[in-house]
């Protein structure tokens, strides 16, 4: 959704054997808009493979036609495969829907890497591991892709959760949540957990198993531990956010916070890595480079073009820094930190020579188009996408991976005064210029 | 240079057939959308049809939709327009022209440019 | 299906002289509008297209503007090549669908 390197996104076993899951702390927190408590019926519902996103059952059509839909909070398209194409094992059938109508407009959506265009329409759409209800949704039937679809990655289209604004071919084309939460009694927000194996995983294990949960309306207590901090969305169109200040091992990088949100900083479920923008990227590598010194790695691996390996179980976690990412606070002058571990930000990969080794990929990477705050960031956290109150709230995952040392941390209030002015007021330019995101 | 070369056209009875090419030159045809246009004598323009690059999208206008079929051969370059149960409202000139870019929805993919036409007279 | 109106229907000028081109939709076809020129016994060839992008090698006494329903093109000084006729054309919704056109004749 963003531009850069958006594979669409990974996801692994929950409660992965190579990490430990956090106990669960109780804590009273104050009501939040939505139902709260436990949503069995949600909960588990997201499957995906590292690298290749994270996606949910949905039905389209009478009689229903089941897919499998890539969940992205940094578009706001639902769009599926309509037609044969060799990355898909099925597709949506316009014509044998009874309910299909069609719109009669066509589409186009560029990513950064990859495209598609396809007809508009309307049809019922339900989310059978979701809340029980079948809503009209606008359709994008995609007839033409190019280097969006990925072999083997199990999903057959993509669920755009973030607001009209940004949403082809213009913002008059209602986002599927938008339509949800219109026709029914669904609260206006959802929350995601996305669950980072920490090892690599193959078609089989992947299909048997849980990538995460996707609670639509409310907030689900099992999925995290300590409390829920919400920083303010800035503006309604991507998930945009402001950072305030970054830390590596609890050193600021001593940035003008501006450079951390240039030109904009978003939470986007549809891009594997953390990317930073170029003087942030630069400034977090040399950071990092230096606190894991005690061994060398070739610069391909810090542009995430080469993978390093070790000798099953033996990774040096601890040579690794922590990232902490400070986010505006709901109060004024308020700010909270979350912080992952490498655990996060190093992404197990295959290696198909040495395949005895545990071998990572640098999910840190480089933007043009400002920080995104992609699978890296969500695996750690429980995260509330609350449009109802305008914020996004982050809490410690239960299944994120970690080891006996560190976790993953959400922790404030801290005190960062003028925090305004860290965000970027983007020129107004055409919005046919605006690129849809997705590395 | 960019060329494009229609053929086939002719008379033709009403509830006949008549397939059209268009022969491509001067560019990677297989990356570009391409369509046909019509133009009743002394009349305006009306798109009749369109495809993508790979043939995945189509468009067709209400007039000839079920009756008309656009196809392409990217291997000889070649843009067909098949036409079966032809009418007299079907008579035109016939262009071919070149989209922009693979998409057919593309903003910017506008088509251009256009061969000279062929002429397709239904008539008893 | 949107129409679209172009006016005036002839338009008679003298050569320098500023043309003035009106094409309006039924509906908002948003900025997916394209201008073409055609002049007798020739292919129309793209001049405008995304309601205001000039087309490669379109001179640029050659202008377009306008967004949603009204789009005008402007050919700010007639040379005598440009006296031909002039289709709009929009791509927002099926069916994809020309005006009428507009005749610029030499007065």
């Known amino acids: 959704t963003q531009h850069g390197i958006r594979l669409p996104l990974r996801s692994g076993l929950g409660g992965a054997p190579l990490g430990l899951r956090l106990p669960r702390e109780t804590d009273e927190e104050p009501e939040e808009p939505g139902r709260r408590g436990s949503f069995v019926e949600m909960v588990d519902n997201l499957r995906g493979k590292s690298g290749q996103g994270y996606y949910v059952e949905m039905t389209v059509g009478s009689p229903p036609q089941t897919l499998n839909i890539l969940v992205d909070t940094g578009s706001s398209n639902f769009a599926v495969g309509a037609a044969p194409h060799p990355f898909l094992h099925r597709y949506y059938q316009r014509q044998l829907s009874s309910t299909y109508r069609d719109l009669r407009k066509g589409v186009y959506v560029p990513y950064t890497q990859g495209k598609w265009e396809g007809e508009l329409g309307t049809d019922l759409v339900s989310i059978p591991h979701g809340p029980n209800v079948t809503v009209r949704a606008n359709i994008a039937a995609i007839t033409e892709s190019d280097k969006f679809f990925i072999n083997g990655s199990n999903w057959e289209g993509i669920l755009g959760l973030a607001y009209a604004e940004i949403a082809r071919p213009d913002d008059s084309l209602e986002p599927f949540f938008d339509s949800l939460v219109k026709q029914t009694h669904v609260p206006n927000l959802f929350s995601l957990q996305l669950c980072g194996a920490g090892f690599p995983l193959n078609q089989s294990e992947v299909l048997a198993s849980v990538g995460g949960s996707m609670i639509i309306g409310g907030i689900d207590h099992s999925l995290y531990t300590g409390s829920l901090w919400y920083t303010p969305i800035r503006r309604e169109w991507y998930y945009e956010v402001i950072i305030v200040r970054v830390e590596i091992n609890g050193q600021d990088l001593k940035m003008d916070c501006k450079e951390y949100n240039y030109d904009k900083s978003i939470v986007d479920s549809g891009t594997t890595n953390l990317r930073l923008p170029k003087k942030v990227f630069e400034a977090a590598v040399k950071s990092i480079k230096a606190a894991s010194s005690t061994e060398k790695f070739p610069d391909g691996f810090w542009l995430g073009e080469q993978l390093v390996c070790w000798q099953a179980g033996t990774t040096p976690w601890n040579i690794f820094p922590v990232i902490s990412l400070y986010l505006m606070g709901e109060v004024t002058n308020q700010s909270f930190r979350i912080t992952i571990l490498p655990q996060q930000y190093l992404r197990p990969v295959e290696d198909v020579a040495t395949s005895q080794d545990d071998c990572y990929k640098f999910a840190i990477s480089q933007s043009s188009t400002g920080t995104v705050m992609g699978a890296v960031i969500m695996e750690g956290f429980y995260v509330v996408f609350d449009r109802a109150r305008k914020r996004i709230g982050f809490a410690v995952s239960a299944c994120h991976v970690h080891d006996e040392f560190r976790t993953a941390a959400v922790e404030g209030p801290f005190v960062t005064l003028d925090m305004e002015d860290c965000g970027y007021n983007i020129p107004q330019t055409d919005e046919s210029t605006l690129m849809t995101g997705r590395a | 240079e960019v060329q494009l070369l229609e053929s086939g056209g002719g008379l033709v009875q009403p509830g006949g057939s008549l397939r059209l090419s268009c022969a491509a030159s001067?560019?990677?045809?297989?990356?570009?959308?391409m369509g046909w246009v019509r133009q009743a004598p002394g009349k305006g323009l009306e798109w009749v049809s369109a495809?993508?690059?790979?043939?995945?999208?189509?468009y067709y206008a209400d007039s000839v939709k079920g009756r008309f079929t656009i196809s392409r051969d990217n291997s000889k370059n070649t843009l067909y327009l098949q036409m079966n149960s032809l009418r007299a409202e079907d008579t035109a000139v016939y262009y071919c022209?070149?989209?922009?870019?693979?998409?057919?929805?593309?903003?910017?993919?506008?088509?251009?440019?256009w061969g000279q036409g062929t002429l397709v007279t239904v008539s008893s | 299906e949107i129409v679209l109106t172009q006016s005036p229907a002839t338009l008679s000028l003298s050569p320098g002289e500023r043309a003035t081109l009106s094409c309006r939709a039924s509906q908002s076809v948003s900025s997916y509008l394209a201008w073409y020129q055609q002049k007798p016994g020739q292919a129309p060839r793209l001049l405008i297209y995304?309601?205001?992008n000039r087309a490669t090698g379109i001179p640029a006494r050659f202008s377009g503007s306008g967004s949603g329903t009204d789009f005008t093109l402007t050919i700010s000084s007639l040379e005598p090549e440009d006296f031909a006729v002039y289709y709009c054309v929009q791509r927002s919704n099926f069916p994809w669908t020309f005006g009428g056109g507009t005749k610029v004749e030499i007065k």
């Open positions: 001067g560019f990677t045809f297989s990356t570009y959308a």
């Open positions: 995304d309601a205001s």
């Open positions: 022209a070149k989209g922009g870019s693979q998409w057919l929805y593309a903003p910017g993919s506008w088509f251009d440019p």
């Open positions: 495809t993508s690059g790979s043939g995945g999208s189509t």
